[in-house]
Interface confidence: low
């Protein structure tokens, strides 16, 4: 003979010694019917705020307040948003590895520094985890016996400069 608790709907609880489906009391929920107890609803407080309020059939869902982000399944922890120079990983905020940077607050991923040499430019300022490399002007390389024509401002005559 089937126990009547098996027919209970979500939002109810049922005790086998008294197989009657009863509604979950306030601030509790049951997502599966026929359980002997309803679960206590999660309270979102402190660094948490309610994303979804508790109902008799679903637990509350929390999210983190401004300036913090969730960690863990179902947002079990709030961690301060990543600073510039960091990126968010599954383990939380991690400092950008050497050669990468993130200049954004709270968001973004670490991106590689600009390779100045690809454009034939020098490095003016080394990059940091927060800032990209600053490239200088193109590096001028003279080949042997290059002739440079120099025309003084306001003067029509050019001077030829032999670089040996």
């Amino acid at each position: 003979v089937q126990n009547s608790c098996d027919n209970c709907q979500p939002g109810t609880f049922c005790r086998k010694y008294n197989p009657v489906c009863k509604s979950c009391p306030p601030s509790t929920f049951s997502s599966i019917g026929g359980q002997p107890n309803c679960n206590i609803c999660r309270v979102c407080a402190g660094y948490f705020r309610f994303k979804k309020f508790c109902s008799s059939t679903h637990n509350a869902e929390c999210e983190c307040i401004e300036g913090f982000h969730c960690l863990g399944p179902q947002c079990t922890r709030c961690e301060k948003d990543c600073r510039p120079g960091q990126e968010l990983t599954k383990q939380g905020c991690k400092t950008c590895s050497l050669g990468t940077f993130n200049d954004q607050n709270g968001t973004g991923v670490c991106r590689p520094w600009t390779n100045c040499s690809l454009d034939g430019r020098s490095v003016l300022k080394t990059g940091t985890t927060e800032k990209d490399v600053v490239c200088g002007p193109p590096v001028v390389s003279f080949s042997p016996s290059t002739t440079i024509s120099v025309t003084p401002e306001g003067g029509p005559g050019g001077h030829s400069l032999q670089v040996l």
């Epitope: 120079g85 400092t95 003016l124 300022k125 080394t126 940091t128 985890t129 800032k131 200088g136």
Partner: antibody
């Protein structure tokens, strides 16, 4: 010849603002790639990096002190400055300024340091 | 922040001795480590940068080695003028951090 010299108040009281000046010669903070850094050393303890200022007025601060530090420069004099607000006895230290080498981001020339005592 | 642990904190050696000072980083800093020398009442002086590049004017008895997390400054033959405090600096990541220093004395 590159030289740097720090100057400051010597002694000040808790909650006051510490103003430090680094007067340098032999290089210009308007030269691309150059910077000046401030570092401190409490008596008998290790060195602590505080802040950098670069030729283009870009600034870097130690995150643990960021809200109390302000670094600035005057290229015409030429000088770099550091302000530390709301000082405490823990800020008692020798304060150094140093030049940052272009293309490598490390300090090559340092000043002699200036002793600052915070006492009530 | 990356912690830099320097050892020993105090060292007594004789003229002509081979002296080694170690610096250990709490995480990989590649080769971005400098060594500085500070004599009493003087400004710190850059000896080595990026582990083993010697600053101009530094005597060849000084050398640097290591990579990753473990670094060494070696003085091949200690001279009286080498009496000073030596400290390391990592500039791999921000904030840059220093070792606690090694005070070197003559026996």
């Amino acid at each position: 010849q590159v030289t740097l010299k720090e100057s400051g108040p010597g002694i000040l009281q808790p909650s006051q603002t510490l103003s430090l000046t680094c007067t340098f010669s032999g290089f210009s903070l308007s030269t691309d790639g150059l910077g000046v850094t401030w570092i401190r050393q409490p008596s008998g303890k290790g060195l602590e990096w505080l802040a950098n200022i670069w030729w283009d007025d870009d600034k870097d601060y130690n995150p643990s002190l960021k809200n109390r530090l302000t670094i600035s420069k005057d290229t015409s004099n030429p000088q770099a400055f550091l302000k530390i607000t709301n000082v405490d006895t823990a800020d008692t230290a020798t304060y150094y300024c140093a030049r940052i080498v272009p293309n490598s981001g490390h300090e090559d020339y340092w000043g002699q340091g200036v002793m600052v005592i915070v006492s009530s | 922040d990356i912690q830099m642990t320097q050892s020993p904190s105090f060292l007594s050696a004789s003229v002509g001795d081979r002296v080694t000072i170690n610096c250990k980083a709490s995480q990989n800093i590649n080769r971005y480590l400098n060594w500085y020398q500070q004599k009493l009442g003087e400004a710190p002086k850059l000896l080595m940068y990026n582990t083993n590049s010697m600053q101009t004017g530094i005597p060849s008895r000084f050398s640097g080695s290591g990579s990753g997390t473990d670094f060494t400054l070696t003085i091949s033959s200690l001279q009286p003028e080498d009496v000073a405090t030596y400290f390391c600096l990592q500039h791999n990541s921000w904030p840059r951090t220093f070792g606690g220093g090694t005070k070197l004395e003559l026996k």
